[in-house]
Amino acid sequence: MMTGTIETTGNISAEKGGSIILQCHLSSTTAQVTQVNWEQQDQLLAICNADLGWHISPSFKDRVAPGPGLGLTLQSLTVNDTGEYFCIYHTYPDGTYTGRIFLEVLESSVAEHGARFQIP
């Protein structure tokens, strides 16, 4: 029986050009985590294997960094990075647990826009 639950950072936002940490945590199970996959739609961003370490998919190598921990750091964000991200925990003997994070990448903040047009 699968007793575990995944806690995630939920719905998050970040500014264009900035970076964000995607984080999931599996709790309430004694199952062994063998691998965590990070995904966006049908794209595999990265794999963190308990024995072998990290593999970042070549398409994302320039903009994705492993960690902290089992999390994933997305860098040089663009508006196209807006969307759903999934952490897939492969465990033994439980099987697979999935967490969802929604990321919204925003244009520069209102405060910054405002500062640009202030009258001296």
Partner: antibody, heavy 120, light 107 residues
Framework: EVQLQESGPGLVKPSETLSLTCAVS????????WNWIRQPPGKKLEWMGY???????YYNPSLKSRITISRDTSKNQFSLKLSSVTAADTAVYYC??????????????WGQGTTVTVSS | DIVMTQSPDSLAVSLGERATINCKAS??????VAWYQQKPGQSPKLMIY???YRYTGVPDRFSGSGSGTDFTLTISSLQAEDVAVYYC?????????FGGGTKVEIK
């Protein structure tokens, strides 16, 4: 250039233990992942398991009760033991390296393979 | 375990013509797919990883595509030295599994 060379008996009796060794040159087995893969005649390639750079092992669950992969870092070699063999274990056995960081689970270096026949 | 099913089992193509090999995964493996070439009497050689990335030294007539459950290896202009058996493999999750192979011959 990474080179892998399998060695061991070509004939094993049913119920006995199959033992193979893979000698690695041109690269240290304390980096990356070192695998055994087999191909029974007329059948698919079957990934059997690995020993990681740190010495951790992972075995295909279909073989888990019978397989042991170990290593000797002083000789830069790793070994396969498969117990209680039957005719179904007759195959070409390959040792192989996998650079998980760069290529994920894709195997980039293979030995030339050794044929093992299980027969009385 | 994830089952990788290749089609066709064998393929005869004229020299200089296009060869297309298909691989279907029993569940979504995103882009965690590799392709290997195995010539008679030799061990497999890595050709493509991450579904579409050519391994070092692989000629550009070889290309891979697909994501999810359906993948394709294409040889754009078949050469005599391409005669071999080609295998797909998934590494989305362990145990890593292979397809049954497609034999490519010259027509």
């Amino acid at each position: 250039e990474v080179q892998l060379q399998e060695s061991g008996p070509g004939l094993v009796k049913p119920s006995e233990t199959l033992s193979l060794t893979c000698a690695v040159s041109g690269y240290s087995i304390t980096s990356d992942s070192w695998n055994w893969i087999r191909q029974p005649p007329g059948k698919k390639l079957e990934w059997m398991g690995y020993i990681s750079y740190s010495g951790n092992t992972y075995y295909n669950p279909s073989l888990k009760s019978r397989i042991t992969i170990s290593r000797d870092t002083s000789k830069n070699q790793f070994s396969l033991k498969l117990s209680s063999v039957t005719a179904a274990d007759t195959a070409v056995y390959y040792c192989a390296r996998l650079d998980f960081s760069n290529y994920g689970g894709a195997v980039d270096y293979w030995g030339q393979g050794t044929t093992v026949t299980v027969s009385s | 375990d994830i089952v990788m099913t290749q089609s066709p089992d064998s393929l005869a193509v004229s020299l200089g013509e296009r060869a297309t090999i298909n691989c279907k995964a029993s569940q979504n493996v995103r882009t965690a797919v590799a392709w290997y070439q195995q010539k008679p009497g030799q061990s497999p050689k890595l050709m493509i990883y991450s579904a579409s990335y050519r391994y070092t030294g692989v000629p550009d007539r070889f290309s891979g595509s697909g994501s999810g459950t359906d993948f394709t290896l294409t040889i754009s202009s078949l050469q005599a030295e391409d005669v071999a058996v080609y295998y797909c493999q998934q590494y989305y999750t362990t145990p890593w599994t292979f397809g049954g192979g497609t034999k490519v011959e010259i027509k």
